[in-house]
């Protein structure tokens, strides 16, 4: 049975330029993380981190996605075409697949300067201190 | 230590089908995007195809004088995988391997020794 | 389709710098691999994912990967180094090896 949950970082905004980290966090589950999959709103793939082999950026995004922290993402010099949807899908054992949704809106500059006041902070998890051993890896 | 064996290979005619396959070892096979890749005699390199990882999607890509042509599949449970090749053609005689695609950095490893496939009547 | 494109043949002297470049359309936007093969032989990855190395191939072996060239350069050229090199422009979608550069140390 699946019991776990997916927590993202929801819907979040970042300047055009910037950059800005996508982060999955998996709760409620004993289950091994195998693999995390990190998916743009048209399905191509950014990025793999397979928990034996490490990570995989993929060749359209090397130049300016970078693994971390912890299973998430980082998503670098950011621009209008960033906006969208982005979905972390974490294969596990034995549960199966979980999947989770962020989306990212990129704003021009004066705009998210102006409207950085208005964005609610995420309850809870606290991103900075992610790594791969809060993310039940059992071995 | 990452190991690759090809074998199936063989003369064939014209028209005729054949399966190679490619024993894998020394790493988690199920992790792996394999590729088929091909050489004839005296030329160069050809990619022919390749299968992404079951938690990729497990989907195929085909070059574009195979395609509908071959048809690659992997036992993950038996760390194999396969190339099934029908509507052989003699520019279809080449040294066939196996490879691991150079995704992960804890895995890069060698080719195979390669098997013959010779189409010929 | 995608094609690449090798020198044919490339000359150096031992101890010299050798420089095989592979072109393609936007090949900066995939990866380059090269590989390396001697008569006989199979293929060994020599360069992967633009710049790595896997283990046990020599420091003098690098490459680069930006606009339209793949760059593959060997430092301190040995009488070993002498081999047929392939490069290979890496997706998630497709694979294509260039035509091969038969590398020649006088």
């Known amino acids: 049975m699946m019991t776990g949950t997916i927590e993202t970082t929801g819907n979040i905004s970042a300047k055009k330029g910037g950059s800005v980290i996508l982060q999955c966090h998996l709760s409620s589950t004993m289950a091994q993380v195998t693999q995390v999959n990190w998916e743009q709103h048209d399905h191509s793939l950014l990025a793999i981190r397979n928990a034996e082999l490490g990570w995989h950026i993929y060749p359209a995004f090397k130049d300016r996605v970078a693994p971390g922290p912890g299973l998430g993402l980082t998503l670098q010099s950011l621009t209008m075409n960033d906006t969208g949807e982005y979905f972390c899908t974490y294969h596990t054992y034995p549960d199966g697949t979980y999947r989770g949704r962020i989306f990212l809106e990129v704003l021009e500059s004066s705009v998210a300067e102006h409207s950085a006041r208005f964005q609610i902070p995420i309850e809870g998890r606290d991103y900075k201190d992610d790594d791969d051993k809060h993310h039940h890896h059992h071995h | 230590e990452v190991q690759l064996v090809e074998s199936g290979g063989g003369l064939v005619k014209p028209g005729g089908s054949l399966r190679l396959s490619c024993a894998a070892s020394g790493f988690t096979f199920s992790y792996a995007w394999m590729s088929w890749v091909r050489q004839a005699p005296g030329k160069g390199l050809e990619w022919v195809g390749r299968?992404?990882?079951?938690?990729?999607?497990?989907?195929?890509d085909y070059a574009a004088p195979v395609k509908g042509r071959f048809t690659i599949s992997r036992d993950d449970s038996k760390d194999t995988l396969y190339l099934l090749m029908n509507s052989l053609k003699t520019e279809d005689t080449a040294v066939y391997y196996c490879?691991?695609?150079?995704?992960?950095?804890?895995?890069?490893?060698?080719w195979g020794q390669g098997t013959l496939v010779t189409v010929s009547s | 389709s995608y094609e690449l494109t090798q020198p044919p043949s490339v000359s150096v002297s031992p101890g010299q710098t050798a420089s095989i470049t592979c072109s393609g359309d936007k090949l900066g936007d995939k990866y380059g691999c090269w590989y390396q093969q001697k008569p006989g032989q199979s293929p060994i990855l020599v360069i992967y994912?633009?710049?790595k190395r896997p283990s046990g191939i020599p420091e003098r072996f690098s490459g680069s990967n930006s606009g339209n060239t793949a760059t593959l350069t060997i430092s301190g050229t040995q009488a070993m180094d002498e081999a047929d090199y392939y490069c290979?422009?890496?997706?998630?979608?497709?694979?294509?090896f260039g035509g091969g550069t038969k590398l020649t140390v006088l």
């Open positions: 299968i992404k990882s079951k938690t990729n999607g497990g989907t195929t």
């Open positions: 290979q422009a890496w997706d998630s979608s497709t694979v294509v």
């Open positions: 994912q633009d710049s």
């Open positions: 490879t691991i695609d150079p995704l992960y950095d804890l895995l890069t490893g060698p």
